[in-house]
């Protein structure tokens, strides 16, 4: 043993759950990749935990993770990519509980941004396009894209659009009239890379016309 | 193998600047990790000076952070550390390092070059 | 900055003796730190990583523990070649600090 049970904190910390989730952001800054873990009961008594990961690395053996409050990572360029890296849970010299991990099952993609919505009034539609650091990116190239909508009244229907390119057309008759609408994107890896779903992009609002008395056709704003 | 080599004038006069070099074999300053520079004043212990990342970035220790400026020339695979109005307090042996960022340890290091500041 | 205390600044022990030498931090740094070997006129070289691990090449005699604030370094049996200035260093958070060393002399 390495000493740290003296007071009982080891003992006790057998105890405790210990489970905990990662994701991985590829060429996150530059050619850097970043992991990012976290205990999933937010209870846990942090204070001497720490993370590493051991196994598919570059040059390397292991990398100990940075702690900011409750979130553990590391960012560096020396994931292999290939093959499971072992992560756990360390208390001193002791590991409390380890996970295999494919770091290419476990991408978390950046959320898109510069959401916009443009009407044209001869089309009578709405043309949606957005933006994604991915397409500039080596690895994870292919997304899944999920554009949701809702009037901005109704508090949780929100319509879902998924699609894989960046640009997306709503027609004006499947909206409300004179309304105004919310939307937002968001990714997720759709091609030898998997993982979870991005953080949501910034929301967009935009007004639909009202309906044109004589044409019965909305006006546009 | 990787190897360092510190390179430049041993003595160097009070108020001008000191200049070191660095070349680096067996690896190259493009591909990963931070490359510092560290240095001993005479008979005492070790201080960090700064790096430069691969991705060209730099971080100085605050201490010294209006004096440095450490660059690089990749077509040489080599880093420079520049350190402006020097004071008989900079004497010291400079060294060159890899290591650091992500890594918690220098592995490999430059044999050092002593730098005399004196009129 | 974070201060690295490092005891004692010497020590004389016999070949065979086992060596200790502890380092302090000033706050938390989890396993980011090193020990180093230097010996009169030459660079330090690196002996244990993340606060425990031994690097390439170094004998096993020597070990390190320790997490969070409180490091040692061990030298199971000490060695002729043993006989140098042992320091440790924190990555942890910039600057990157060393402590003051320790000179192991022959008794």
């Known amino acids: 043993e390495s000493g740290y049970a003296q007071n009982g904190d080891l003992e006790d910390a057998e105890l405790d759950d210990y489970s905990f989730s990662c994701y991985s952001q590829l060429e996150v800054n530059g050619s850097q990749h970043s992991l990012t873990c976290a205990f999933e009961d937010p209870d846990v008594n942090i204070t001497n935990l720490e993370f590493e990961i051991c196994g598919a690395l570059v040059e390397v053996k292991c990398l100990n993770f940075r702690k900011l409050q409750e979130i553990y990572f590391i960012e560096t360029k020396k994931f292999l990519l290939i093959g499971k890296s072992n992560i756990c849970v360390k208390v001193g010299e002791k590991s409390l509980t380890c996970k295999k991990i494919d770091l290419t099952t476990i991408v978390k993609p950046e959320a898109p941004f510069d959401l916009s919505v443009v009407y044209r009034e001869g089309a009578n539609d709405f043309v949606v396009t957005f933006n994604t650091s991915h397409l500039q990116k080596k690895y994870v190239k292919v997304l899944m894209h999920d554009v949701a909508y809702r009037q901005e009244k109704d508090e949780n229907k929100w319509t879902h659009v998924n699609l894989s390119s960046t640009k997306l057309t709503l027609l004006q008759r499947k909206l409300q009239p004179a309304a105004m609408y919310e939307i937002k994107v968001r990714s997720i890896p759709d091609h030898y890379f998997k993982g979870f779903w991005s953080e949501w992009s910034p929301s967009y609002y935009f007004r639909t016309p009202e309906i044109n008395n004589s044409s019965g056709e909305m006006d546009p704003i | 193998q990787v190897q360092l080599q510190e390179s430049g004038p041993g003595l160097v006069k009070p108020s001008e600047t000191l200049s070191l070099t660095c070349t680096v074999s067996?690896?190259?300053?493009?591909?990963?990790?931070?490359w510092n520079w560290i240095r001993q004043p005479p008979g005492k212990g070790l201080e960090w000076i700064g790096y430069i990342f691969y991705s060209g970035s730099t971080t100085y220790t605050p201490s010294l952070k209006s004096r440095i400026t450490i660059s690089r020339d990749t077509s040489k695979n080599q880093f420079s550390l520049k350190l402006s109005s020097v004071t008989a307090a900079d004497t010291a042996v400079y060294y060159c390092?890899?290591?650091?960022?992500?890594?918690?340890?220098?592995?490999?290091w430059g044999q050092g070059t002593t730098v005399t500041v004196s009129s | 900055d974070i201060q690295m205390l490092q005891s004692p600044s010497s020590l004389s022990a016999s070949v065979g003796d086992r060596v200790t030498i502890t380092c302090l931090a000033s706050?938390?740094?989890?396993?980011?730190l090193a020990w180093y070997q230097q010996k009169p006129g030459k660079a330090p070289k690196l002996l244990i990583y993340?606060?425990?691990r031994l690097a390439d090449g170094v004998p096993s005699r020597f070990s390190g523990s320790g997490s969070g604030t409180m490091f040692t370094l061990t030298i199971s049996s000490l060695q002729p070649e043993d006989f140098a200035t042992y320091y440790c260093q924190q990555f942890f958070s910039y600057p990157w600090t060393f402590g003051g060393g320790t000179k192991v002399e022959i008794k």
């Open positions: 067996g690896y190259s300053v493009t591909t990963d990790y931070a």
């Open positions: 993340a606060a425990t």
């Open positions: 706050q938390t740094i989890g396993y980011w």
């Open positions: 390092a890899r290591g650091g960022y992500d890594v918690n340890y220098f592995d490999y």
